[in-house]
Interface confidence: medium
């Protein structure tokens, strides 16, 4: 039950996170005009990954797309790439995790396959979240650098009569959305990985080991009697795993996943 809850919650958290990453990527407010200690202008500038906008005092907004690809800063291209990779990985992770959900039955899919898919989607969510966090952080770093550069220019370039007040940009709403969304996707991924451990079948069956006594040709299967008499774990639909020989006591001390059902 706990495994199902962890897996389901991981899926939902990741879903919200990926929706947030998509929203952040599409948002225009990655950087917004810094209004603090600046002359009050009749227009407000803000920029996204794909276009820049100008909002007039009347509320009328005009946006222009970045129609050039080669003319854009390499950092902006890198941020775009990171966000897109994050979205793609997250989307694939979501698709995989849907089939991995314990509450969804697809044919005779074995629990081990579900466990593998849960782990795969978890890793994908983790990488997706990291990509989003990295992308947003790179952009934020770029803003901080440009902010202080333009601040220095504002105070050094005032020798003449004419002042050219540079438009300084600060963190926009999309950065915070991106950080939170990336964090949620990361948390969701970790939860999926944790759920995977609970989903993985316990190694209660072992490969047959032949013991040849002189003059006899008898194969002895350790634990075989226990499995067949129904005292141990239910072996239905379970693969026989290679594992180190364990004593009867050791086997009993590890509860199987079916003890939680």
């Amino acid at each position: 039950m706990a495994v199902t809850a962890c897996q389901g919650l991981g899926f939902v958290v990741s879903l919200i996170g990926i929706a947030g990453i998509i929203a952040a990527t599409c948002m225009d407010q990655w950087s917004t005009q810094d209004l603090y200690n600046n002359p009050v202008t009749a227009v407000f500038n803000y920029q996204g990954l794909w276009r820049s906008c100008v909002r007039e005092s009347s509320g009328f907004t005009e946006c222009r797309g970045y129609f050039t690809l080669l003319g854009l800063p390499a950092m902006l291209q890198a941020v775009r790439a990171l966000m897109i990779v994050g979205i793609v990985l997250g989307a694939i992770g979501l698709l995989v995790s849907i089939f991995a959900l314990k509450c969804i039955r697809i044919g005779s899919m074995e629990d081990s396959a579900k466990a593998n898919m849960t782990l795969t989607s978890g890793i994908m969510f983790i990488v997706s979240g990291l990509c989003a966090i990295a992308g947003v952080s790179v952009f934020a770093n770029m803003l901080v650098t440009n902010f202080w550069m333009s601040t220095a220019n504002m105070y050094t370039g005032m020798g003449g009569m004419v002042q050219t007040v540079q438009t300084r940009y600060t963190f926009g709403a999309a950065l915070f959305v991106g950080w939170v969304a990336g964090g949620l996707t990361l948390i969701g991924g970790v939860m999926m990985c944790i759920a995977c451990r609970g989903l993985a079948p316990e190694e209660t069956n072992y490969k047959a080991v032949s013991y040849h006594a002189s003059g006899h040709s008898v194969a002895y299967k350790p634990g075989g009697f226990k499995a067949s008499t129904g005292f141990g774990s239910n072996t239905k639909n379970k693969k026989i795993y290679d594992g180190g020989a364990r004593t009867e006591d050791e086997v009993q001390s590890y509860p199987s996943k079916h003890d939680y059902v």
Partner: antibody, heavy 117, light 113 residues
Framework: QVQLKESGPGLVAPSQSLSITCTVS????????VSWIRQPPGKGLEWLGV???????YYNSALKSRLSISKDNSKSQVFLRMNSLQTDDTAMYYC???????????WGQGTTLTVSS | DVVMTQSPSSLTVTAGEKVTMSCKSS????????????LTWYQQKPGQPPKILIY???TRESGVPDRFTGSGSGTDFSLTITSVQAEDLAVYYC?????????FGAGTKLELK
């Protein structure tokens, strides 16, 4: 068509307050901003302040403490209130409509204000 | 506040002549966001309210004759009338339409010889 009409007291005594109304037609105050501008006799134009469609206001920094701009969207009226009037406040007072893109595209005919005892 | 300086304060011309007046601002009126210069030119004839001629420094308002041309960027702007007509005699004002408070230039008076 777009029209703006200013109406004021005409004559005000020094240190008194002024209230001028700008009644607009042909457009909605919820869509466009309105600015107030004055012009002393034989002199240039001086911007007083603006009230935008969303209600945000900006004022001339030299007159900020004496000025107040408000509006009544339902009556299509914009009000200019100014206190502690002096003789140098004698001027023609205009209200003008801002386009979406902010420039002043339509002006009223103006109302004359004389500050005299 | 942004100071708008217009020159000359008055111009005496003959009909058909080309005339250029200047407007300088103490701060750049160029918005980096859309690369537009927020400077507007107005014409005021005696006894009338001002009328818009040019916005964004160079965009002619609809209905304005094409003999009126605005140019310039940043802090230096100019208004050119290619062939002055009698009806062009008026006072021309430039307006900083970018920084609050909005500020007008002192005006350039265009007179006939």
């Amino acid at each position: 068509q777009v029209q703006l009409k200013e109406s004021g007291p005409g004559l005000v005594a020094p240190s008194q307050s002024l209230s001028i109304t700008c009644t607009v037609s042909g457009f909605s105050l919820t869509d466009y901003g309105v600015s107030w501008i004055r012009q002393p006799p034989g002199k240039g134009l001086e911007w007083l302040g603006v009230i935008w469609n969303r209600g945000n206001t900006y004022y001339n920094s030299a007159l900020k403490s004496r000025l107040s701009i408000s509006k009544d969207n339902s009556k299509s009226q914009v009000f200019l209130r100014m206190n502690s009037l002096q003789t140098d406040d004698t001027a023609m007072y205009y209200c003008a409509k801002h386009d979406f893109l902010r420039f002043l595209d339509y002006w009223g005919q103006g109302t004359t204000l004389t500050v005299s005892s | 506040d942004v100071v708008m300086t217009q020159s000359p304060s008055s111009l005496t011309v003959t009909a058909g002549e080309k005339v250029t007046m200047s407007c300088k601002s103490s701060q750049s009126l160029l918005n980096s966001g859309n690369q537009k210069n927020y400077l507007t030119w107005y014409q005021q004839k005696p006894g009338q309210p001002p009328k818009i001629l040019i916005y964004w420094a160079s965009t002619r308002e609809s209905g304005v004759p094409d003999r009126f041309t605005g140019s310039g960027s940043g802090t230096d702007f100019s208004l050119t009338i290619t062939s002055v007509q009698a009806e062009d005699l008026a006072v021309y004002y430039c307006l900083n339409d970018y920084y609050y408070p909005l500020t007008f230039g002192a005006g350039t008076k265009l007179e006939l010889k």
